[in-house]
Amino acid sequence: IWELKKDVYVVELDWYPDAPGEMVVLTCDTPEEDGITWTLDQSSEVLGSGKTLTIQVKEFGDAGQYTCHKGGEVLSHSLLLLHKKEDGIWSTDILKDQKEPKNKTFLRCEAKNYSGRFTCWWLTTISTDLTFSVKSSRGSSDPQGVTCGAATLSAERVRGDNKEYEYSVECQEDSACPAAEESLPIEVMVDAVHKLKYENYTSSFFIRDIIKPDPPKNLQLKPLKNSRQVEVSWEYPDTWSTPHSYFSLTFCVQVQGKSKREKKDRAFTDKTSATVICRKNASISVRAQDRYYSSSWSEWASVPCSGSGSSRGGSGSGGSGGGGSKLRAVPGGSSPAWTQCQQLSQKLCTLAWSAHPLVGHMDLREEGDEETTNDVPHIQCGDGCDPQGLRDNSQFCLQRIHQGLIFYEKLLGSDIFTGEPSLLPDSPVGQLHASLLGLSQLLQPEGHHWETQQIPSLSPSQPWQRLLLRFKILRSLQAFVAVAARVFAHGAATLSP
């Protein structure tokens, strides 16, 4: 038994036929010693007398609000809730399995940008006697603060004969660092109470994995002379992280009729305009995705082909233009070839995802993961890789990126990747290895040597363990190269001569 909040206790029960249950001793919160009686809920039946009451809790009939009285006056309450465990698994009766992206997904979370603000939601078919409380932190062993609001009913839907209720909560990381590479996941814990049943649900994620931008805004059409083609332009959503030269998006533009089965024109672009073929009765739609990290696509923003107006009002800085001042020359160091670094780092992003695209959909986090990933160098908040830090002195950040590149290059050349199951030299991992080396050489000025970190002795003995470790390393590398690509894109846009 443990205390959920003041005067509310959770009794954990193994739930099977003829289970012995749990013996619980309740103590009346009073200095009085004599003449104390106990009742349960609204019943006037006296269950016992004395300052303590010992009960055997086996089923929901044994749970509820226990009250101690003296001479018709209430002294204190203790609310007992039950938390069922069947076959070693805690019950999940209150929330509905959303089955996306995988089975046993009860909580789903999304973030519109890298500010540390995110929203989680869950579904239930229960309409009454239901309360939720939400807690969150970054990391679990040495948790950093995340503040969550109250959960609210956000939508009601009819699903067949049932009504489905959606609850949501907004959370904000207390000291968010949008430009840093996350090393510890956000943990979200939801306590759910329905009548006398207690359940808890958890989710663990990196903000980068739950990013879903808002749709592009201000879609505009401009027909091209003597052509079937139309130029469509749009702007970054207002909620996306800035500057856009650092936090860049990529876009998918599609022309399609009302039915999904109809023919379509489709193209991908990093710009904020594209040329497409518009058909009568069709619509042009545009959606956005983080350019350097394969998180979710936004919903579509659409405008009909017939109208050459805009889909939504609103102005604002469009495109991925840098804005702001130029980065000044690096004191005591030479500037890198920003544009070359940008191209190579973007290639690294693509290779990191093609080296094992499945990695993006596998949950590789497990017990002891914080220890495994602690050995890997992360681009942290103080490393100067944010836009302001790059403006002040990009050398600190470039040194950090260089260290990381060398570290991963060594890892990819180590026994973890060269051992069984074997990879061919020109596999995506082979190409990734070569590109890491290429970018690190571009960054390393002649005759200037930066300190590099030793690679940890991680090599496992079993092939399956090696495979799992590869996936974890690649997953971590995907995050690292995304930050590096943002740095070089911003540098190319704002520093390159």
């Epitope: 023919k263 489709r266 193209a267 991908f268 672009t269 040329t275 073929i277 058909r279």
Partner: antibody, heavy 118, light 107 residues
Framework: QVQLVQSGAEVKKPGASVKVSCKAS????????LHWVRQAPGQGLEWMGW????????EYAPKFQGRVTMTTDTSTSTAYMELRSLRSDDTAVYYC???????????WGQGTMVTVSS | EIVMTQSPATLSVSPGERATLSCRAS??????LHWYQQKPGQAPRLLIY???QSISGIPARFSGSGSGTEFTLTISSLQSEDFAVYYC?????????FGGGTKVEIK
């Protein structure tokens, strides 16, 4: 399944015109874009243009503009490509292909060899 | 127009080996890149669309990667039926253009 059957080989004199046909089956004719791509002997592939059978809209590669005409007959589910003012370097296999997506080529016809020779 | 360059022009590979074919665009084309296989006397066949998307019915040994200006088609373990000419095609802008092709031949 979606199938495209093209007309037979043609031999033409320089300056003449050729009209190649492409009969579609296995799908609703107006649901797919139709493209024409050619391939000179021993050479690579060259895109000529597309037509939307639903409305007759066309887009031609600049190289063929003014010399090519693409048409369709929805009653017979047939597409046509006419190339005028033939030259010897127009000798090639001409392919029609269909796709629900405009910008790449999914289902191909078997090809029609057009030889331009005096 | 966008010029597509494929390399090498000819690739000699033994059956069972891996083949890596390259395609470069004269300007950035995002992931608007598609791969085709053509055997002698046959029409081309679509293998990969939008740089890395696989087609149902195409063996899993064919995979594509890349974005921007550099793209790769990888055949993980060449089978006898894979010896053919491979073309890349950009769909970033009209006119649609193809690379010159890479002939994969038996070593």
């Amino acid at each position: 399944q979606v199938q495209l059957v093209q007309s037979g080989a043609e031999v033409k004199k320089p300056g003449a015109s050729v009209k190649v046909s492409c009969k579609a089956s296995g799908y609703t004719f107006t649901d797919y874009y139709l493209h024409w791509v050619r391939q000179a002997p021993g050479q690579g592939l060259e895109w000529m243009g597309w037509i939307d059978p639903e409305n007759g809209d066309t887009e031609y590669a600049p190289k063929f503009q003014g010399r090519v005409t693409m048409t369709t007959d929805t009653s017979t589910s047939t597409a046509y490509m006419e190339l005028r003012s033939l030259r010897s370097d127009d000798t090639a296999v001409y392919y029609c292909n269909a796709n629900k997506e405009l910008r790449y080529f999914d289902v191909w016809g078997q090809g029609t060899m057009v030889t331009v020779s005096s | 127009e966008i010029v597509m360059t494929q390399s090498p022009a000819t690739l000699s590979v033994s059956p069972g080996e891996r083949a890596t074919l390259s395609c470069r665009a004269s300007q950035s084309i995002s992931i608007n890149l598609h791969w085709y296989q053509q055997k002698p006397g046959q029409a081309p066949r679509l293998l990969i669309y939008f740089a890395s998307q696989s087609i149902s019915g195409i063996p899993a040994r064919f995979s594509g990667s890349g974005s921007g200006t550099e793209f790769t088609l990888t055949i993980s373990s060449l089978q006898s039926e894979d010896f053919a000419v491979y073309y890349c095609q950009q769909s970033n802008s009209f006119p649609l253009t193809f690379g010159g092709g890479t002939k994969v031949e038996i070593k």
